[in-house]
């Protein structure tokens, strides 16, 4: 069964920034993976970036940099500054799309107990979601 | 089958404003960026910025912040960009696109001109 | 920003001749994670807004015909027309799809010899 991981770290450097990692653990074919904030895409929360891996990355505000880590797995670092900054118990989830699968979505947030530059372990933690 | 439709010609004086429409449809509205283009006569291509219309989050190119503004409303699946203080040098072809730049508007005409 | 430089400006080639147009990118195009190059070819005729031909240098959108073909990694690319016809006279870009802002080559205007 495909699953997807979501690790989030505070960076120890600037304690308002964090990374987000994401994975997909399956077979298929990547067609395209979102990252939001706040909860699930579309069931109130805001999409931070959107990577195709091969059309682009597109990305928005407080993110910086979104990339493929991998054929598999993205990073996404988040600058924390003003009203749009990231705290400490924001949720993050990604989506991914794929086939033949279809689409599998999964969230994390920072343990309560994180030191800054500590990772929270990678979460697997799918939803099935048929909506291709 | 996506579409993009936009607004029809504009003629404006300079120093004016001029708001040019993208309705869409044929796809989730929300879900991808709306792409804003231009291309002055016999000129190349020139990315303005995008809106990603589910957040209403945007991203301008530099040349243009402060005159620009795009917008969306989600509810009529249409996007809107707006540029301020015209001057002679944005008569253009103005274009909107999604999904990479995969689909495109048919394009408005903006004639700046006193 | 990244500068996309195309050449020739123009070029003209006879009806079921080959056609070869070149671009290259100030910074690399290429995402080393996933070793996919970030640069698109689109077409453009009279009258008419850009039609995306290739994306990831070399992927086709789908309905282009199989006589466009793209090629190249890092900063350089080329856009292939293996078999010139008449409806191919247009002007075509090069377009970083890497890294903001999206930027746009100057140009190719191919014609028929």
């Known amino acids: 069964t495909p699953e997807v991981w979501v690790q989030v770290r505070m960076e120890a450097t600037e304690l308002s920034s964090f990374t987000i990692r994401c994975g997909f653990l399956g077979s298929g074919s990547i067609s395209l993976v979102t990252v939001s904030w706040g909860g699930p895409n579309g069931a109130g929360g805001t999409t931070l970036a959107v990577l195709h891996p091969e059309r682009g990355i597109r990305q928005w505000a407080p993110a910086r940099q979104a990339r493929w880590e991998t054929q598999s797995s993205i990073s996404l670092i988040l600058e924390g500054s003003g009203a749009s900054s990231p705290c400490a118990n924001t949720t993050f989830c990604c989506k991914f799309a794929s086939f033949p699968e279809g689409s599998w979505e999964a969230c994390g947030s920072l343990p309560p107990s994180s030191d800054p530059g500590l990772s929270a372990p990678p979460t697997p933690a799918p939803i099935l979601r048929a909506d291709l | 089958e996506v579409q993009l439709v936009q607004s029809g010609a504009e003629v404006k004086k300079p120093g004016s404003s001029v708001k040019v429409s993208c309705k869409a449809s044929?796809?989730?509205?929300?879900?991808?960026?709306i792409e804003w283009v231009r291309q002055a006569p016999g000129q190349g291509l020139e990315w303005m910025g995008e809106?990603?219309?589910?957040?209403?989050?945007?991203n301008y190119n530099e040349k243009f912040k402060g005159r620009v503004t795009i917008t969306a409303d989600e509810s009529t699946s249409t996007a809107y960009m707006e540029l301020s203080s015209l001057r002679s040098e944005d008569t253009a072809v103005y274009y909107c696109?999604?999904?990479?730049?995969?689909?495109w508007g048919q394009g408005t005409l903006v004639t700046v001109s006193s | 920003d990244i500068v996309m430089t195309q050449s020739p400006d123009s070029l003209a080639v006879s009806l079921g001749e080959r056609a070869t147009i070149n671009c290259k990118s100030s910074?690399?195009?290429?995402?080393?994670?996933?070793?996919?190059?970030?640069l698109a070819w689109y077409q453009q005729k009279p009258g008419q807004p850009p039609k995306l031909l290739i994306y990831g240098a070399s992927t086709r959108e789908s309905g282009v015909p199989d006589r466009f073909s793209g090629s190249g990694s890092g900063t350089d690319f080329t856009l292939t027309i293996s078999s010139l016809q008449a409806e191919d006279v247009a002007v075509y870009y090069c377009q970083n799809a890497h890294s903001y802002p999206p930027t746009f080559g100057q140009g190719t205007k191919l014609e028929i010899k």
């Open positions: 044929g796809y989730t509205f929300s879900s991808f960026s």
């Open positions: 696109s999604s999904y990479w730049f995969a689909y």
């Open positions: 809106i990603l219309p589910g957040s209403n989050s945007t």
């Open positions: 910074q690399s195009l290429l995402n080393s994670g996933n070793q996919k190059n970030y």
